[in-house]
Amino acid sequence: EEELQVIQPDKSVSVAAGESAILHCTVTSLIPVGPIQWFRGAGPARELIYNQKEGHFPRVTTVSESTKRENMDFSISISNITPADAGTYYCVKFRKGSPDTEFKSGAGTELSVRAKPS
C-alpha cells in the first residue's frame, strides 16, 4: 500500500467576512491509524483549529460523514469568518501513540478575508 498523502487542493480561498469558509482536505490511505488535526500557521506557535480526536470547536464542522472508516475527506467549514481568521491552514495527519506523532501535513490553504459586501 502506498504511503498516505494529505491533499489540500486549494492553494488559496477567499471568503467575505461573516460567511463560512470551506477548507478542503483528503487523505489517500486508511493507514496509519490516528487523528486528523487542522492548524492555522506552522511551527511551534501554530493554532489548533480542529482536532478529530477531542475538544470543542464551536465554529468548525466537518463537511463529510465522519462516522465511516472509509471516509477520507477531512474538509472543514469554519463559520462566521472575520479578518482575524486570515492565514494559512494546514490539514495534518497524526499517528496514534503516546504521544500522537505528526505523520504528514498538507501543503496548506491560504485563507483571505474580503470586506463584508455593503
Epitope: 491509524v33 478529530q52 477531542e54 462516522t67 496514534k96 503516546s98 500522537d100
Partner: antibody, heavy 118, light 107 residues
Framework: EVQLVESGGGLVQPGGSLRLSCAAS????????MHWVRQATGKGLEWVSA???????YYTGSVKGRFTISRENAKNSLYLQMNSLRAGDTAVYYC????????????WGQGTMVTVSS | DIQMTQSPSSLSASVGDRVTITCRAS??????LAWFQQKPGKAPKSLIY???SLHSGVPSKFSGSGSGTDFTLTISSLQPEDFATYYC?????????FGQGTKLEIK
C-alpha cells in the same frame, strides 16, 4: 444495521483445530481494523488477535504460531484459524470492530463458545 | 506489555448512588483508554473511548476522565440496569490489554 455474528465454536480435543467465522453486515469489513477477544468462564476479557486494513496481523503472545487471523472481503467475513488447541484456550470468542479513526472497539458480536477438552 | 490495573475489584452501591472506578496503566497511554460494561451471559458493550468520549447511544450519566496513566469512570445516579462488570482497556499499542474488571453489585 451494523452487526457481527460469530460461528464455528464447539468442543474439540487438545491438539485439535477449529475455525471461527465472523460475518459482518451493515459496513465494509475491509475498511476497519478487526479483532478477536476471548473470555474464559468467570474470567476477564483478553485480546487475542487483530488484522489491519492493509492485512497486517497481530497476536497475543500465548497464541502466536498457533492462531491465524484472516478475512475474506468478498464474503465480508473475518476468521480465526485455531490450531494446536489447549485447555487454556477454552473461552467465549468475540469478534469486535475497531473504531473509525483510533481503533477503539465499537461493535461486538454475540460470541461463540470454544471448549477444549478430552 | 502494558498492564492495566482496576480498582476496586468489586463495589457495592445503592440505586441513586454515584460511583467511581479507577484504572491505572503501567505506562503512559495518552488517552487511548476505553471502558466497557458487561452483564452476565452477554457480550460487552462499549461505553467510552479516548478516555472521555461516549459511544453513540450511551447515556450521559456515564463519564470518563484522565490521561497518561490514571483514568476514572463515573456513573452518576445508579439505576438497576447499571449493576454489571466494568472493564477498562488500553488500545495505544499491541497487545491491547484489559483491566481485570470491577463488579458493581447492589447493596
Amino acid at each position: 444495521e451494523v452487526q457481527l455474528v460469530e460461528s464455528g465454536g464447539g468442543l474439540v480435543q487438545p491438539g485439535g483445530s477449529l475455525r471461527l467465522s465472523c460475518a459482518a453486515s451493515g459496513f465494509t469489513l475491509s475498511s476497519y481494523d478487526m479483532h478477536w477477544v476471548r473470555q474464559a468462564t468467570g474470567k476477564g476479557l483478553e485480546w487475542v488477535s487483530a488484522i489491519g486494513t492493509a492485512g497486517d496481523t497481530y497476536y497475543t503472545g500465548s497464541v502466536k504460531g498457533r492462531f491465524t487471523i484472516s478475512r475474506e472481503n468478498a464474503k465480508n467475513s473475518l476468521y480465526l484459524q485455531m490450531n494446536s488447541l489447549r485447555a487454556g484456550d477454552t473461552a467465549v470468542y468475540y469478534c469486535v470492530r475497531g473504531g473509525v479513526w483510533d481503533d477503539a472497539f465499537d461493535i461486538w458480536g454475540q460470541g461463540t463458545m470454544v471448549t477444549v477438552s478430552s | 506489555d502494558i498492564q492495566m490495573t482496576q480498582s476496586p475489584s468489586s463495589l457495592s452501591a445503592s440505586v441513586g448512588d454515584r460511583v467511581t472506578i479507577t484504572c491505572r496503566a503501567s505506562q503512559d497511554i495518552n488517552n487511548y483508554l476505553a471502558w466497557f460494561q458487561q452483564k452476565p451471559g452477554k457480550a460487552p458493550k462499549s461505553l467510552i473511548y479516548t478516555a472521555s468520549s461516549l459511544h453513540s447511544g450511551v447515556p450521559s450519566k456515564f463519564s470518563g476522565s484522565g490521561s497518561g496513566t490514571d483514568f476514572t469512570l463515573t456513573i452518576s445516579s445508579l439505576q438497576p440496569e447499571d449493576f454489571a462488570t466494568y472493564y477498562c482497556q488500553q488500545y495505544v499499542s499491541y497487545p491491547y490489554t484489559f483491566g481485570q474488571g470491577t463488579k458493581l453489585e447492589i447493596k
